[in-house]
Amino acid sequence: HTAAQDNCTCPTNKMTVCSPDGPGGRCQCRALGSGMAVDCSTLTSKCLLLKARMSAPKNARTLVRPSEHALVDNDGLYDPDCDPEGRFKARQCNQTSVCWCVNSVGVRRTDKGDLSLRCDELVRTHHILIDLRHRPTAGAFNHSDLDAELRRLFRERYRLHPKFVAAVHYEQPTIQIELRQNTSQKAAGDVDIGDAAYYFERDIKGESLFQGRGGLDLRVRGEPLQVERTLIYYLDEIPPKFSMKRLT
């Protein structure tokens, strides 16, 4: 990778081990936990990142800082099974043979069952709503400036094309970023909205996944945009299948 011709590191994923053992002595990086080769010009899949996070030695792991506002997927962190492309396998099981089905962002979408549970396909999360509340500012941000800045951020930092940022809504102090992406809309090289949302979530929490890059410094016309809470909602192409018991 150019990634770091000189010191051989992965700019888009610090949870990697890199060495100049690629073709022609080029830098090649592998994700911790899975050992899978990653492309350091783009985001690493959320599945491989979760796997790396779970495999990191306890004392080196950067745990999520507990916060009453932080919404983790209700089941919290787990060590996922990833397919050869780094995507979540449709069925996930823990060490005690409890299994469940997940969507493309790794969030549970069925009740938990046993090893007989079948998950026929990986259901795509095609709509992600990122709900942010920003800290008080002197005045409200200009909506169009905010929209432009967030689109620029998602393109430059997360490599997500603006076509997938469906809308930016703003009613001070709440900002909502809508990401939409059907399977058929993704062209070669397009970043997955689930991966972009995960990198953004980690950036907002001050747990950047980028190597040696400063933390997220969001500014709208020079005014700092500081987020005090984040909620992320995932909508799947096929609605989830939970029993009525859970819904009550």
């Epitope: 150019t2 689109r151 430059e156 993704k186 062209a187 090289g189």
Partner: antibody, heavy 119, light 108 residues
Framework: QVQLVQSGAEVKKPGASVKVSCKAS????????MHWVRQAPGQGLEWMGE????????SYNQKFKGRVTITRDTSTSTAYMELSSLRSEDTAVYYC????????????WGQGTLVTVSS | DIQMTQSPSSLSASVGDRVTITCRAS??????LNWYQQKPGKAPKLLIY???RLHSGVPSRFSGSGSGTDFTLTISSLQPEDFATYFC??????????FGQGTKLEIK
């Protein structure tokens, strides 16, 4: 192998419109971005706009202020670029080029279509 | 828009020479820099993408380096077929994607 074949040269009068076609083969048309780039005689390259053939999403270089329209026909794996209100400065070779979503590199190009605008 | 500036705008060299062309971006573009070769009357051809990755079929005498705002295309040993015009292009930010003005490489 990947091929992009463009329509032939055109001569147009100022104020008219031109529509250039680009037929793709050798790959799945809907799986790659398609871009249009032009080059005036003896000049550099200028990006005009892009389309995702799968859903028809487009974005354009604001320089062209609504004069450019990019469309596609997935049944024939063909992309089109229409430029309206032509002026003499639009005389150029127009290229279609297949693009990558992350690098935004143009890995395969059409042979080019010369559009001459002259009264 | 991000401006891309190439230097030199033209240069003369001989077969076997080592040649370097530089490209400077008006702001940080990380590594999202691509290089193209164009011969008279022909369409451009992609040589290098993402600063240093060789496009398929491109000879290994071509190499690229750089990061941020300053980038370099190097031809280690010029061959007769390398005399052409070279363009850099950034794919970092929101459209429009921009090209350098070109560097014409001529036979000395």
């Amino acid at each position: 192998q990947v091929q992009l074949v463009q329509s032939g040269a055109e001569v147009k009068k100022p104020g008219a419109s031109v529509k250039v076609s680009c037929k793709a083969s050798g790959y799945t048309f809907t799986s790659y971005w398609m871009h249009w780039v032009r080059q005036a005689p003896g000049q550099g390259l200028e990006w005009m706009g892009e389309i995702t053939p799968s859903d028809g999403y487009t974005s354009y270089n604001q320089k062209f202020k609504g004069r450019v329209t990019i469309t596609r026909d997935t049944s024939t794996s063909t992309a089109y670029m229409e430029l309206s209100s032509l002026r003499s400065e639009d005389t150029a070779v127009y290229y279609c080029a297949r693009g990558h979503g992350n690098y935004v590199s143009f890995d395969y190009w059409g042979q080019g279509t010369l559009v001459t605008v002259s009264s | 828009d991000i401006q891309m500036t190439q230097s030199p705008s033209s240069l003369s060299a001989s077969v076997g020479d080592r040649v370097t062309i530089t490209c400077r971006a008006s702001q940080d573009i990380s590594n999202y820099l691509n290089w193209y070769q164009q011969k008279p009357g022909k369409a451009p051809k992609l040589l290098i993408y993402y600063t240093s990755r060789l496009h398929s079929g491109v000879p290994s005498r071509f190499s690229g380096s750089g990061s941020g705002t300053d980038f370099t295309l190097t031809i280690s040993s010029l061959q007769p077929e390398d005399f052409a015009t070279y363009f850099c292009q950034q794919g970092y930010t929101l459209p429009p994607y921009t090209f350098g003005q070109g560097t014409k490489l001529e036979i000395k």
